[in-house]
Interface confidence: medium
């Protein structure tokens, strides 16, 4: 399908101008190449009538221009004078008119109305107001007002001064006369429809001194306009339908098939399960505007779209109404990331987010998305540090890769964190984007002992078993805090060779402490990664206790992944108090996280990857 | 968490205006929905506006419709409410609130991180 997108249909009358503006995938070739409009024939040929290289042909001399937007992606087509001969199919496109690159429009030029002499015109929106004003003479002050509705031959009586109101008007129309000395009286129209289109006279007083006005009503269905989004990128619909239905319940729907339209969402709680995790309806304004944003946009989203007020939360005749035409770009600038990322309890996920490369100092922010009142999406953690607290020790964003993506991991996960979550920065509004995590059955890849207790002043060993599926990875082993995970420094990983096999011994990386201190209570991540793309993380909490018994801290690495319960003893290894089963959040609560800063000179930190065998003693 | 200082409150006298200020340390409040409440002595905490993190979006109580502006300025770190027409009814301390809510519908429940109040007294 062409991703060149402009309005199906476009309407005029005789004599007026109309401007139309096609889009198109603002790519440097597509910005500079040649831009036309064009006239189908009957033959199927299309004929150019205007090109943005100057081209005008004679039909449309002196009263069309095509005018190029580059930095928008856009042109537009103005065209002038307009005759009945005007109407018919064109093309607005790119580049050579047979290549395909180009929309369809249908131009209508019809016959304006005959209308009598002196009628003034009223143009309206359909589920408007409209004040129609009635002059009138002194000697028809104290008589009858009156508007009528002329339906072919006869008038049709709609309101008067004596109180009488024609059904179909019933609620929403009221006829002021004013104080003395002003000579016009007004009828209000509420809510119009599409069949209060038509001629009107207002009356005041009878027989040949009356006074007499005509007012053409035009009621107009809201011309959708035009919204070019692209795949996986994100739309917000803006709505602003007046002080009138601030109070009234919003709703924003899909036209269908049918012609009928299909809620979307709307303030009364109903929400279509195909925008689950991708909607949010924003609260209204004090003027009774509100908006919706939808993330993760996909083709089937393509459509015409309303949104109005009603106190059923749905499309009514005679409500106030805006509408909207959304076209989907395939030819996205958001480039494809998982929209599914799936992990096991007790596992990590690692999620990649788009984001507009050009805006790299951007904040970025990621949020868990609300099904709860019209959606909503608490932040979760930004690019400069956690928000929510109860994620202390297993969230993180980290600006990496950069040049357009950054990454939040993750782990520790639970059953909780299955949903919807959202990448945001505060730049490029279109760049939202949606991820699902999904839990799924299995055993985390990484294995790290429960929470670990240091003392004071001693060394610490903590090992990390992964299987040989990460052997060709980076292993890395990092300090958590809440503005990201200091990576530690690493000590010679032993020799490349203990990989190749990967026998049971040799894969292990471990994470020295020598000597312990305050500072080094916390959490800690072992993590595995290619390059700037991170992978699996397993969380680990160190409590620094003071000194008790002499001898060194050492976390037997045949027995990390021991049982929560289980006490490991080993020759020349003290008891382990494995405090897996306590939520490691409820003690590391409230506790200032230090820097890490001077863990950068020495080898007080250090990271060791190698065989077991190398690590002084087995427990096999 | 976000740090908040709010300042501008003072005597003023009905029909006056005041401008209150919430500055942010600690943290930016970019992400952040900020909102001002009130809290009249021997009365409950009442919610009198709020502001999603564009400034795009904006809520009143009903009772200042009209009458109260909020606004931000997320460079300076900084929310503003400017309160014209002030009633004797509008005496209160006024705090100055932030919740971590990206959009959507926000209750009073979600603000986590509040200010310590600036009292604004309207004479009769």
């Known amino acids: 399908k062409s991703p060149v997108f402009g309005p199906q249909e476009v309407s005029s009358v005789e004599g007026n101008s109309v401007s139309i503006k096609c889009y198109y995938p603002p790519t440097s070739v597509n910005r500079h190449t040649r831009k036309y409009w064009c006239r189908k024939g009957a033959s199927g040929r299309c004929i150019t009538l205007v090109s943005s290289e100057g081209y005008v042909s004679s039909n449309y001399a002196g009263r069309a221009n095509l005018t190029n937007f580059p930095e928008n992606g856009t042109f537009v087509v103005n065209i002038a004078q307009l005759s009945r001969d005007d109407s018919g199919h064109y093309k607005c496109g790119l580049g050579i008119n047979s290549r395909g690159l180009s929309f369809d429009v249908s131009l209508e030029v019809s016959q304006g109305p005959e209308l009598p002499n002196g009628t003034e015109v009223y143009t309206v929106d359909v589920g408007r107001t409209v004040t129609i004003k009635c002059p009138f003479k002194t000697e028809n002050a104290p008589k009858t007002k009156a508007l009528y509705k002329k339906i072919g031959q006869t008038s049709v009586l709609v309101i008067d001064s004596r109180n009488y109101v024609n059904p179909n008007y019933k609620d929403r129309i009221r006829l002021r006369i004013p104080g003395t000395g002003q000579l016009i009286f007004t009828v209000v129209i509420d809510r119009l429809r599409l069949s209060d289109h038509g001629l009107y006279l207002c009356q005041a007083g009878d027989g040949s001194n009356r006074d007499e006005k005509n007012a053409d009503l035009q009621v107009l269905e809201p011309e959708p306009e035009l919204v070019y989004e692209d795949l996986r990128g994100s739309v917000t619909f803006h709505c602003a339908l007046g002080l009138e239905v601030a109070n009234v319940a919003k709703f924003l729907c899909r036209v269908n098939s049918r012609e009928t339209c299909d809620v979307v969402i709307n303030t009364l709680g109903k929400r279509d399960s195909a925008f689950e995790g991708r909607i949010l309806l924003n609260p209204q304004d004090k003027d009774g505007s509100f908006s919706v944003v939808i993330t993760g946009l996909r083709k089937e989203d393509e459509g015409r779209y309303l949104c109005g007020a009603h106190s059923d939360g749905q499309l009514q005749e005679g409500w106030p109404i805006q509408a909207w035409q959304l076209f989907v770009n395939e030819e996205s600038t958001i480039p494809r990331s998982p929209t599914v990322v799936k992990g096991v309890a007790g596992g990590s996920v690692a999620v990649l987010c788009p984001y507009n490369p050009k805006e790299s100092q951007s904040l970025k922010y990621w949020c868990l998305w609300e099904g709860a009142q019209n959606g909503r999406c608490p932040l979760l953690v930004e690019s400069q540090g956690l928000v929510q607290e109860q994620y202390e020790g297993r969230l993180s964003l980290l600006q990496e890769p950069g040049n357009g993506t950054f990454t939040v991991i993750l782990n520790q996960l639970t059953t909780q964190d299955a949903g919807f979550y959202w990448c945001l920065t505060n730049g490029d509004t279109r760049w939202r984007t949606t991820v699902e995590i999904k839990i799924i059955e299995g055993e985390p890849n990484l294995k790290v002992p429960g929470n670990v207790t240091a003392v004071l002043g001693e060394t610490l060993n903590i090992p990390c078993h992964f299987p040989c599926k990460f052997s060709s990875y980076e292993k890395y082993w990092c300090k958590w805090s809440n503005t990201g995970c200091q990576t530690l420094p690493s000590q010679d990983e032993g020799p490349s060779e203990a990989f190749v096999n990967c026998d049971e011994n040799s894969r292990l990386v471990s994470l020295t402490l020598n000597p312990v201190t305050r500072a080094d209570e916390g959490w800690y991540w072992c993590g595995v990664k290619q390059g700037h793309f991170y992978g699996e993380t397993a969380a680990v909490y160190v409590a620094v206790e003071e000194k008790k018994v002499a001898g060194s801290r050492y976390v037997s690495p045949a027995k990390a992944d021991a049982a929560p319960d289980e006490k490991v003893l080993d020759s020349g290894v003290r008891e382990i108090e494995n405090k897996a089963i306590q939520d490691p959040r409820l003690f590391a609560e409230e506790k200032v996280v230090a820097d890490t800063g001077d863990q950068a000179g020495g080898s007080r930190a250090s990271v060791d990857s190698s065989s077991s065998e190398e690590q002084g003693g087995s427990s096999k | 968490q976000v740090q908040l200082v709010e300042s501008g409150g003072g005597l003023v006298q009905a029909g006056g205006s005041l401008r209150l200020s919430c500055a942010a340390s600690g943290r930016t409040i970019n992400g952040y929905v900020m909102g001002w409440f009130r809290q009249a002595p021997g009365k409950e905490r009442e919610f009198v506006a709020r502001?999603?993190?564009?400034?795009?979006?904006?809520d009143y109580a009903d009772s200042v419709k009209g009458r109260f502006t909020i606004s931000r300025d997320n460079a300076k770190t900084t929310v503003y409410l400017q309160t014209n027409s002030l009633k004797p009814e509008d005496t209160a301390v006024y705090y100055c609130?932030?919740?971590?809510?990206?959009?959507?519908?926000?209750?009073?429940?979600?603000?986590?991180?509040w200010g310590q109040g600036t009292q604004v007294t309207v004479s009769s």
């Open positions: 609130a932030g919740s971590a809510y990206y959009s959507g519908y926000v209750t009073h429940r979600d603000f986590g991180s």
């Open positions: 502001i999603d993190w564009s400034g795009s979006s904006t």
